[in-house]
């Protein structure tokens, strides 16, 4: 913490300018009025402060705004944003996409994923929902950031906005996020023709239920292995060998390469070896001929 001292008269600060770079930490602490700093935040980023000096300025703002900075200050944080912790950001109320853009630009190239995720969360809360303008800003300035949002936040995306999401924006999304986004995508794209529909829905399929995957297998979509491997294990397990063959089309040969990886490995274990042999890929590990399969999970559910 910076120790308190009295400001020498000749060092009194009346405006935020370049002369401050020659101030020692304790001089900045003693001589810079927090209200003046807040009022002239737009000047700070143009001044080549050291990281130590930025620490002092942040400390001044924290004292002035213990409940969180106003957006007028946040908008002009510039490189001071690099000093913010997720805990600091959680106190903010941000509604302006210009503020978001400015801070996303500053964070580029720095290890700030937690701060950026919290900032985006605050923007979504501040704006009330994840609207098209916010999604457009995220996809333009922070590819992959959409997946930093919690499923609860993603639930505020209107289906009409889903069309603005690009495949690369979903690369880092986990199953829980895709569970929220997939049904919205299915609603958003439901009026498209089969082939156009598949192109659009493909990045979201990690959230699809079995019945949708089965339906796709009837539509000659020739799903690529990368997409197949991202399907939910629970969605893949009930598929028959014939359904998987129809679903993958010419890509079915890729099953051999993924034989030891989930969900392919788990799916193989559920199939009859006879059926697997019909693929001619040498897949091993299926249920031997003559064995009886008892699905105890369904029996328990029925009892």
């Amino acid at each position: 913490d910076v120790e308190r001292t009295t400001c020498p008269p000749e060092k009194e600060v009346h405006e935020i300018d370049e002369s401050l770079i020659f101030y020692k930490k304790r001089e900045l602490e003693a001589c810079v009025d927090a209200a003046l700093l807040a009022a002239q935040m737009d000047r700070v980023d143009a001044i080549p402060f050291t990281y130590e000096q930025l620490d002092v300025l942040k400390h001044k703002l924290d004292e002035l705004y213990p409940q969180g900075y106003p957006e007028s200050v946040i908008r002009h944080l510039g490189h001071l944003f690099l000093k913010m912790s997720p805990e600091d950001i959680r106190k903010w109320n941000v509604t302006s996409l210009e503020t978001l853009k400015a801070l996303l630009k500053v964070s580029k190239g720095h290890e700030m994923s937690a701060q950026v995720a919290t900032l985006i969360d605050r923007v979504v809360v501040g704006r009330g929902q994840l609207d098209k303008d916010t999604v457009d800003t995220l996809t333009a300035f922070c590819p992959g950031c959409l997946c930093s949002l919690s499923p609860e936040r993603l639930s505020s995306v209107p289906p009409s906005v889903i069309g603005a999401v690009r495949p690369q924006d979903l690369d880092t999304c986990g199953p829980r996020q895709l569970d929220v986004l997939y049904p919205k995508a299915r609603l958003a794209f439901q009026n498209m023709s089969g082939s156009e529909y598949f192109v659009k829905i493909r990045p979201f399929l990690g959230g699809a239920p079995t019945e949708d995957v089965k339906a796709l297998s009837q539509q000659n979509v020739s799903m690529d292995l990368a997409t197949f491997m991202k399907l939910r294990r629970e969605a893949v397990l009930p598929l028959t060998v014939a359904e998987v063959q129809k679903l993958l089309g010419p890509h079915v040969e890729g099953l051999k390469v993924e034989e030891q990886h989930s969900p392919v490995r788990d799916w193989i274990l559920k199939q009859r070896q006879d059926d697997l042999d019909t693929l001619g890929l040498g897949l091993q590990g299926g249920i031997p001929n003559g064995y009886l399969i008892l699905d105890l999970s369904v029996r328990e559910a029925l009892s």
Partner: antibody, heavy 122, light 107 residues
Framework: QVQLQESGPGLVKPSETLSLTCTVS????????WSWVRQPPGKGLEWIGY???????NSNPSLKSRVIISVDTSKNQFSLKLSSVTAADTAVYYC????????????????WGRGTLVTVSS | EIVMTQSPATLSVSPGERATLSCRAS??????LAWYQQKPGQAPRLLIY???TRATGIPARFSGSGSGTEFTLTISSLQSEDFAVYYC?????????FGQGTRLEIK
């Protein structure tokens, strides 16, 4: 074939929480989306919300602040909790299966439970 | 939300005759519309989806038409088991919404 059965108390006091469970038999809960729909006596149908087996939900904005839909895949069941009920929540509550097929692409219901009447009264 | 309005509220038709039920959406729902039949004390039963496609097991006398905001359910030759309440439902956007119903009664 798959069947749905609603269960829960038929009488709930005002300001309390209505709790219902839908049991899915004859098939896995994992394969579809599952909804709750209600119908006040002599009136039309109102969609309450859906749940996916993973726990992901979506509900009607008019009820959202009072609704919790949850799922128990081990029991092949999903549940509805509606808090702070009033007489206006008196209705037959149905659980229903959303078709869930891209080939027909839709959010409509091809299978329904028989419904259970819940009366809100002191 | 999209408001669905059905007309008429009650329709009286004689067995063997044709019945035409209407459903109007407050904004376009494209072809994302379903029709259900409900008899007293029973759950609704899916008749039509995609505005015009009959669900599995539904007799050919039931047909649906329309797109955008105007839709029609037609029952070509009424059988005694067809007298019931009919609901339309849009699934173009959430929340999913139903019409208030048309009661089809014997004349």
């Amino acid at each position: 074939q798959v069947q749905l059965q609603e269960s829960g108390p038929g009488l709930v006091k005002p300001s309390e929480t209505l709790s219902l469970t839908c049991t899915v038999s004859g098939g896995s809960i994992n394969n579809y989306y599952w909804s709750w729909v209600r119908q006040p006596p002599g009136k039309g149908l109102e969609w309450i919300g859906y749940i996916f087996y993973s726990g992901s939900t979506n509900s009607n904005p008019s009820l959202k602040s009072r609704v919790i839909i949850s799922v128990d895949t081990s029991k092949n069941q999903f549940s509805l909790k509606l808090s702070s009920v009033t007489a206006a929540d008196t209705a037959v509550y149905y659980c229903a299966r959303e078709v869930g097929r891209i080939a027909v692409a839709g959010w409509f219901f091809d299978l329904w439970g028989r419904g259970t009447l819940v009366t809100v009264s002191s | 939300e999209i408001v669905m309005t059905q007309s008429p509220a009650t329709l009286s038709v004689s067995p063997g005759e044709r019945a035409t039920l209407s459903c109007r959406a407050s904004q376009s729902v494209q072809s994302n519309l379903a029709w259900y039949q409900q008899k007293p004390g029973q759950a609704p039963r899916l008749l039509i989806y995609g505005a015009s496609t009959r669900a599995t097991g539904i007799p050919a006398r039931f047909s649906g038409s329309g797109s955008g905001t105007e839709f029609t359910l037609t029952i070509s030759s009424l059988q005694s088991e067809d007298f019931a309440v009919y609901y339309c439902q849009q699934y173009n956007n959430w929340p999913l919404t139903f019409g208030q119903g048309t009661r089809l009664e014997i004349k």
